[in-house]
Amino acid sequence: CDLPQTHSLGNRRALILLAQMRRISPFSCLKDRHDFEFPQEEFDDKQFQKAQAISVLHEMIQQTFNLFSTKDSSAALDETLLDEFYIELDQQLNDLESCVMQEVGVIESPLMYEDSILAVRKYFQRITLYLTEKKYSSCAWEVVRAEIMRSFSLSINLQKRLKSKE
């Protein structure tokens, strides 16, 4: 399926909003760095069926939405930026859902992609656990924001690769 041109623009806007959410200098947070074990293999150019890639991307954005829509994120981050971020992510989800419908014929991700989706969910569980352990400190949010920017960028790269294969 062809993702609309607005989809890639939305991706860029979402990254810009993430960058703007910075509240403190990251230089004061170096010692809080953490290995969240990003599931890189789910974003590599393996024999990826397009429907599987779209399902993984959908899960990635859904989990990002969930992470940033908790009461703890609302307390730690700028609410106006968060609201704009939700709008962008919501649009991304709609675009990808339309694609899943075209590629697979159902909105639900097929069971054959369960492992990939589970890997993404576990990744976000590790992020949530880290935030909890760090008591949602400013530096913990800064580390998570940097991590989500990185994973979001990798998601964008996967979408670009999908587009170039069309």
């Epitope: 960058a19 990251p26 230089f27 170096l30 010692k31 953490h34 290995d35 969240f36 991590e147 920017m149």
Partner: antibody, heavy 121, light 107 residues
Framework: EVQLVQSGAEVKKPGESLKISCKGS????????IGWVRQMPGKGLEWMGI????????AYSPSFQGQVTISADKSISTAYLQWSSLKASDTAMYYC??????????????WGQGTLVTVSS | DIQMTQSPSSLSASVGDRVTITCRAS??????LNWYQQKPGKAPKLLIY???SLQSGVPSRFSGSGSGTDFTLTISSLQPEDFATYYC?????????FGQGTKVEIK
């Protein structure tokens, strides 16, 4: 291919100003910090400071704070190191290197080729 | 500032030897330690990051271990191209600091 390309060697007199550059390519320049490292003749490596090119936030080693200025122009993927008044003791090789910021990834995984600065009257 | 102390400052070894370089931090730095190799007239090259992770493209004869304050770089079987100066560097907190270097020379 990731590359950091530094400006050429400089010969200056004490009291002169200087700005050397480090141009990044092959990666998203604003996604990594750029650090600067000094190596005086026959000596070891000394970290001078670092910049986040996305917003030009900087951090300096106390030894270099006020002695140099680090800046960046993200529109041309270039970081800079400058002196307003050079001293003979600034004679050294200066390296730039990229840093992953707060991400769990290799530190200083790519380095520039170095810029030799010679300050002599 | 976190002080990094390397030992020895220099060593002589032969091709095929097992070489060990140690690095001690003045306070606990977890696993936030990197090792670099530098040859004369060249920029440093990252070998090991986060104490024990081998950087892409680096031969497996290089390995790193340790956490907290004590770290080790091991070259299992020294090759002619390994004669160089090695530096440790802590990436736990600013200011970032390097060890003074260990020069590995031919015996």
């Amino acid at each position: 291919e990731v590359q950091l390309v530094q400006s050429g060697a400089e010969v200056k007199k004490p009291g002169e100003s200087l700005k050397i550059s480090c141009k990044g390519s092959g990666y998203s320049f604003t996604s990594y910090w750029i650090g600067w490292v000094r190596q005086m003749p026959g000596k070891g490596l000394e970290w001078m400071g670092i910049i986040d090119p996305s917003d030009s936030d900087t951090a300096y080693s106390p030894s270099f704070q006020g002695q140099v200025t680090i800046s960046a122009d993200k529109s041309i993927s270039t970081a800079y190191l400058q002196w307003s008044s050079l001293k003979a003791s600034d004679t050294a090789m200066y390296y730039c290197a990229r840093h992953p910021g707060l991400n769990w990834a290799p530190d200083f995984d790519y380095w520039g080729q170095g810029t030799l600065v010679t300050v002599s009257s | 500032d976190i002080q990094m102390t390397q030992s020895p400052s220099s060593l002589s070894a032969s091709v095929g030897d097992r070489v060990t370089i140690t690095c001690r931090a003045s306070q606990s730095i977890g696993k936030s330690l990197n090792w670099y190799q530098q040859k004369p007239g060249k920029a440093p090259k990252l070998l090991i990051y986060f104490a024990s992770s081998l950087q892409s493209g680096v031969p497996s004869r290089f390995s790193g271990s340790g956490s907290g304050t004590d770290f080790t770089l091991t070259i299992s079987s020294l090759q002619p191209e390994d004669f160089a100066t090695y530096y440790c560097q802590q990436s736990y907190d600013f200011p970032l600091t390097f060890g003074q270097g260990t020069k590995v020379e031919i015996k």
